[in-house]
Amino acid sequence: DISEPPLHDFYCSRLLDLVFLLDGSSRLSEAEFEVLKAFVVDMMERLRISQKWVRVAVVEYHDGSHAYIGLKDRKRPSELRRIASQVKYAGSQVASTSEVLKYTLFQIFSKIDRPEASRIALLLMASQEPQRMSRNFVRYVQGLKKKKVIVIPVGIGPHANLKQIRLIEKQAPENKAFVLSSVDELEQQRDEIVSYLCDLAPEAPPPT
């Protein structure tokens, strides 16, 4: 297992499969998208990333989904952070939360290969998908709940879909939302978000 020394005092050493879902719509400028990516990289620095502890996936979503990192990718944490920083700005007209939750349900968590770990999708959303695209939204959120995937929506800016955020929160008590007025608030909320995610995950059982 490829590990590296911790970079920060707070370091989440839990059993966790964490998926970062990044809104690739033009509701975020390219500069704001860069701040979003920096937030993801900062969060990754605070996780004990390895196949044994915290596994991460990074997906950018627009009208479809583009995975940059998969949960099973065996790379150094520093290399995974580098890849996360390289996520391309799509600046697309639409970012479909329904599509990315469907992708999370049927692609990322299709098979549960680590039942002992917590599963969390951090949904970073700054836009609203058209209504025609959101028909199955609740079904996908419920499907994720059945697979014990916690969905943490982070609404960013004035165009984030608050209705969908509230629907996600209603599905499970763990689905706690963070609503921010702009990307500028990500840094100040980062430690609270990391702590919340980490607290949801179990510690490794002591060696027998």
């Epitope: 400028s29 390219e30 500069a31 860069e34 990516k37 920096a38 580098r82 920083s85 390289q86």
Partner: nanobody, 122 residues
Framework: QVQLVESGGGLVQAGGSLRLSCAAS?????MAWFRQPPGKEREFVAV????????LVAASVKGRFTISRDNAKNTVYLQMTSLKPADTAVYYC??????????????????WGQGTQVTVSS
């Protein structure tokens, strides 16, 4: 190979203004300004993106410094106002080939100018 040439530095009194320019020899995506105060590390100041003209400015200079670009001239500017002695540094222009590393890290940028000295006297 992109070449970057900075100009516009000089000596200015506290409270004064300066405009730095950085001319690029080829097409660039993001263009950034960094600065290196005497005896300190190089630090991020501002960046501008060609796709939509959006910008990011370091918290330490927000409200005083503005970054802009002229795509026709392939030039980026850093307008600095209300200058303080703490702004004294060599200012560098930088650009990247790809997007590897966070926007504020020096490792992200592949091409650098030679730097222009800005001295703010009290």
């Amino acid at each position: 190979q992109v070449q970057l040439v900075e100009s516009g530095g000089g000596l200015v009194q506290a409270g004064g203004s300066l405009r730095l320019s950085c001319a690029a020899s080829g097409r660039t995506k993001d263009m950034a300004w960094f600065r290196q105060p005497p005896g300190k590390e190089r630090e991020f100041v501002a960046v501008i993106y060609s796709s939509d003209g959006s910008t990011l400015v370091a918290a330490s200079v927000k409200g005083r410094f503005t970054i802009s670009r002229d795509n026709a001239k392939n030039t980026v500017y850093l307008q600095m106002t209300s200058l303080k002695p703490a702004d004294t540094a060599v200012y560098y222009c930088a650009t990247s080939r790809g997007y590897s590393g966070t926007y504020y890290s020096t490792s992200r940028y592949d091409y650098w100018g030679q730097g222009t000295q800005v001295t703010v006297s009290s």
